[in-house]
């Protein structure tokens, strides 16, 4: 009998640098300025490994005073990233993430931009704009997507183990056909989760599993066809 | 890349018996369920039954039940198919297939005939 | 056992066209299946395996969607080397199951 317990199948999706944004178009800004303005906070699901551009509420940078970016990352200190029109200058405190910096000279540009996300950018992002006519912020909740790995193996006869290692969140685990079924998760300290979905199937007309994932970065299929029950030699179907 | 290699076609006679072979090679033959499928002349295709290399565990569909008897031989990694009992609606190419359906062998053409 | 219901059977065809196959588990009962490419004097040669995953080498015009019981299989532009008949195939059960085929031909 051969070892059975080696990975069968195994997924790991790759993702080109992609870039994601919330930012409008000066139509949009027109078009949208109020609602905008009262949409303070945005929950923002973007994916590891891809650029990110946050935005400013759509203020002509003709009418500011000072942009600050106000960033909270958990397990470190809050981060402000100020630029102060009048004297054009630039202030930073207890920012040490390079990969988080404004797209282009301030004066120009308000955007933040993160390159290449990782898990440790999940956190609060806001900028408030000082104006004559008042502040004006915009947040973010970042949630940093991890695709998850998926492995299908069996360990036995007639049992199945489909795992989505590492992914945030956790993903969803189903099968084909439904088995009796136990489903475990592992949460790791960087934020990621391990879902460990373990399956026997009695009815012996089961050739093969499928294992389907389900997960915000998308969905995977991975299937495998089952051992026979040791000592079995024929059945007519 | 898993190839299956198939034996020649073959001409019998009705109640005659017919055996078809398929050697397997670029994947661990003991691991993987075998399965034989034919298809009639101008007809769709049709599941005959399976085996399990690593230990001769067989599923025959019914309507073969009797009538058909798979083996294996891991020593040169080959299954066999064998079909008694010949009748002309059994005139057929039989195939070999693996790794749950996605490898397939070129096709044996039984052709039973008086 | 599984019946997998194929239509349609037959298909009149232009190059260019969109073409649509479906196939469906009798009974209700999810499955996972393949879909093959068969032309005359040849063996069935896999194009979509797990209901939805291109094979390596098959043209991007070809592709496969659904879940559980009902599927499709789609071909968004037809070209001359693609007339062929068409079959899916449920893996899930034993016995494994074929749809009854699907012919194109040109018009």
């Known amino acids: 009998q051969p070892n059975n317990s080696l990975m069968l199948q195994t997924s790991k999706e790759n993702h080109a640098l992609a870039s994601s944004s919330l930012c409008m178009d000066e139509k949009q800004i027109t078009q949208n300025y109020s609602k905008v303005l009262a949409e303070v906070n945005t929950s923002w699901p973007v994916k590891m490994a891809t650029n990110a551009v946050l935005c400013c509420p759509p203020i002509a940078l003709r009418n500011l005073i000072i942009i600050t970016w106000e960033i909270i990352l958990r397990g470190q200190p809050s981060c402000t990233k100020a630029y102060k029109k009048e004297t054009n200058e630039t202030k930073e405190t207890n920012c040490t993430d390079e990969r988080i910096t404004w797209v282009s000279r301030p004066d120009q540009n308000s955007d933040l931009q993160i390159r290449t996300v990782a898990i440790t950018h999940d956190g609060y992002y806001r900028c408030i704009m000082v104006t004559p006519d008042g502040n004006f912020h915009r947040g973010y909740h970042l949630q940093v997507l991890v695709t998850p790995e998926v492995t299908l193996f069996q360990n036995r006869n007639r049992t199945a183990v489909c795992k989505a290692v590492a992914g945030k969140p956790a993903a969803h685990i189903s099968w084909i056909p439904e088995g009796d079924c136990a489903t475990k998760q592992e949460y790791w300290s960087n934020g990621t989760v391990t879902v460990k979905s373990t399956c026997h199937w009695e009815v012996h007309n089961v050739s093969t599993v499928t294992c389907h994932v389900s997960h915000l970065t998308g969905n995977k299929s991975l299937y495998i066809e089952l051992l026979p029950v040791p000592g079995a030699k024929k059945s007519a179907k | 890349q898993v190839q299956l290699v198939q034996s020649g076609a073959e001409v019998k006679k009705p109640g005659a018996s017919v055996k078809v072979s398929c050697k397997a090679s670029?994947?661990?033959?003991?691991?993987?369920?075998m399965h034989w499928v034919r298809q009639a002349p101008g007809q769709g295709l049709e599941w005959i039954g399976n085996?399990?290399?690593?230990?001769?565990?067989?599923n025959y569909d019914e309507k073969f039940q009797g009538r058909v008897t798979m083996t294996v031989d891991t020593s040169t990694s080959t299954a066999y198919m064998e079909l008694s009992s010949l009748r002309s609606e059994d005139t057929a190419v039989y195939y070999c297939?693996?790794?749950?359906?996605?490898?397939w062998g070129r096709g044996t053409l039984v052709t039973v005939s008086s | 056992d599984i019946q997998m219901t194929q239509s349609p059977s037959s298909l009149s065809v232009s190059v260019g066209d969109r073409v649509t196959i479906t196939c469906q588990a009798s009974q209700g009962t999810p499955i996972n299946l393949h879909w093959f490419q068969q032309k005359p004097g040849k063996a069935p040669k896999l194009l979509i395996s797990?209901?939805?995953n291109l094979e390596d080498g098959v043209p991007s015009r070809f592709s496969g969607s659904g879940s559980g019981t009902d599927f499709t299989f789609t071909i968004s532009s037809l070209q001359p080397e693609d007339i062929a008949t068409y079959y899916c195939l449920q893996f899930t059960y034993i016995p494994w199951t074929f749809g009854q085929g699907t012919k194109l031909e040109i018009k």
């Open positions: 670029g994947h661990t033959f003991t691991s993987y369920w």
């Open positions: 085996i399990y290399p690593g230990s001769g565990s067989i």
């Open positions: 797990g209901a939805s």
């Open positions: 297939l693996t790794m749950t359906g996605t490898s």
